[in-house]
């Protein structure tokens, strides 16, 4: 907190310039109004102020701005930004996009911060859901963003949103986020055909149900094995031997460089050893000839 | 890294002269705008002088037509000439580029005027 004190003659603002970078932190608290720094916040950016001289703006706007800054000095803050704590952040009610990108731009490049966390928090429930211009510019400046919202807040992306999505968006996400996200992406890209559907909804599958990887194997769609192993476990597990050397095509012969690893070993198992050995690939472990399977899922649900 | 070296300081007597120097690395030193800070004892940091990449200098009003800021880029230096030296110009001087928004840190080097 700076000691208040008079303003040396001579010394009082006229506007924010570069001659400020000279003042020091008393200076700026006796001589910058804060009414003139509001207005002319867009120049503050472009002036090295140290981080301690912009504490001092900050809390001169502070002031000025109680009740939370109006979004005409939100769009301007620039590096100021980097001075505002989440508490400041969800007093502020920021519809713009361009004001969410000018404030994403100055934390380019580093992790996401808990400003940047709330900024985004408050724009996406100002806006009531993530729309894809929105969905666009938090992607572009943190890939793995779509990956840090919960299930339940994935649920409020509409499919249309699904279009903006980039395969490197999806790689942190985990099978219950994949879950909420799939049947989304199916809808948004269903009018397209075969290859090019595949080529979309791919990032995607770890969240699809059997049925749909049952259908994709009759499409010749040559899964590469890192999808394939991606995909849900209980979803694969009731795939046959056919339908999975149709799935992968060519690559099917990965299969024996995986065949320790989920969902490959667990599939391997319900396998009769018959079936896998007409891949010539030398998988072990499936069901011997001559033993009958008893499904006993099956024979609860009947009961 | 980011590496600036200061050098130069020392105890003389008031009206007295330094020249304080100022080595970079680990960064473009002809595109970038440099400046000296200084914080004396008991004081806050204070900037004293800029030197942009065009060449042109600006100064606090307190060492205005004493202190002289250069900078040599075939050297990566950046130097402060201070003549006429005040023992209220005592204090720590480090320097900076001007877009890192540090001020005061680190080690500087260390000018004692007495009277």
């Known amino acids: 907190e700076v000691e208040k004190t008079a303003c040396p003659s001579g010394k009082k603002a006229r506007e924010i310039d570069e001659s400020l970078i000279f003042y020091k932190k008393w200076e700026l608290e006796a001589c910058v109004d804060a009414a003139l720094l509001a207005t002319q916040m867009d120049r503050v950016n472009a002036i090295p102020f140290t981080y301690e001289q912009l504490d001092v703006l900050k809390h001169k706007l502070d002031e000025l701005y109680p009740q939370g800054y109006p979004e005409s000095v939100i769009q301007h803050l620039g590096y100021l930004f980097l001075k505002m704590s989440p508490e400041d952040i969800r007093k502020w009610n920021v519809t713009s996009l361009e004001t969410l990108k000018a404030l994403l731009e100055v934390n380019k490049g580093h992790e996401m911060s808990p400003q940047v966390a709330t900024l985004i928090d408050r724009f996406v429930k100002g806006r009531g859901q993530l729309d894809k211009d929105t969905l666009d510019t938090l992607t572009a400046f943190y890939p793995g963003y779509l990956c840090s919202l919960s299930p339940e807040e994935l649920s409020s992306v509409p499919p249309s949103s699904i279009w903006a999505v980039r395969p490197q968006d999806l790689d942190t996400c985990d099978p219950r986020q994949l879950d909420v996200l799939y049947p989304k992406a199916r809808l948004a890209f269903q009018n397209m055909n075969g290859s090019e559907y595949f080529v979309k909804i791919q990032s995607f599958l770890g969240g699809a149900p059997t049925e749909d990887l049952k259908a994709l194997s009759q499409q010749n769609v040559s899964m590469d094995l890192a999808t394939f192993m991606k995909l849900r476990t209980d979803a694969v597990l009731p795939l046959t031997v056919a339908e999975v050397q149709k799935l992968l095509g060519p690559h099917v012969e990965g299969l024996k460089a995986e065949e320790r690893h989920r969902p490959v070993r667990d599939w391997i198992l319900r396998q009769r050893q018959d079936d896998l050995d007409t891949l010539g690939l030398g998988l072990q472990g499936g069901i011997p000839n001559g033993y009958l399977v008893l499904d006993l899922s099956m024979q609860e649900a009947l009961s | 890294e980011v590496q600036l070296v200061e050098s130069g300081g020392g105890s003389v007597q008031a009206g007295e002269t330094l020249r304080l120097s100022c080595t970079a690395s680990?960064?473009?030193?002809?595109?970038?705008?440099m400046g000296w800070y200084r914080q004396a004892p008991g004081d806050e940091c204070e900037l004293v002088s800029t030197?942009?990449?065009?060449?042109?200098?600006n100064y606090a009003d307190s060492v205005k037509g004493r202190f002289t800021i250069s900078q040599d880029n075939a050297k990566n230096t950046v130097y402060l000439q201070m003549t006429s030296l005040k023992p209220e110009d005592t204090a720590i001087y480090s320097c900076?580029?001007?877009?890192?928004?540090?001020?005061?840190w680190g080690q500087g080097t260390l000018v004692t005027i007495s009277s």
């Open positions: 030197i942009s990449s065009d060449g042109s200098t």
């Open positions: 680990g960064f473009t030193f002809d595109d970038s705008d």
């Open positions: 900076r580029t001007m877009a890192s928004r540090i001020g005061c």
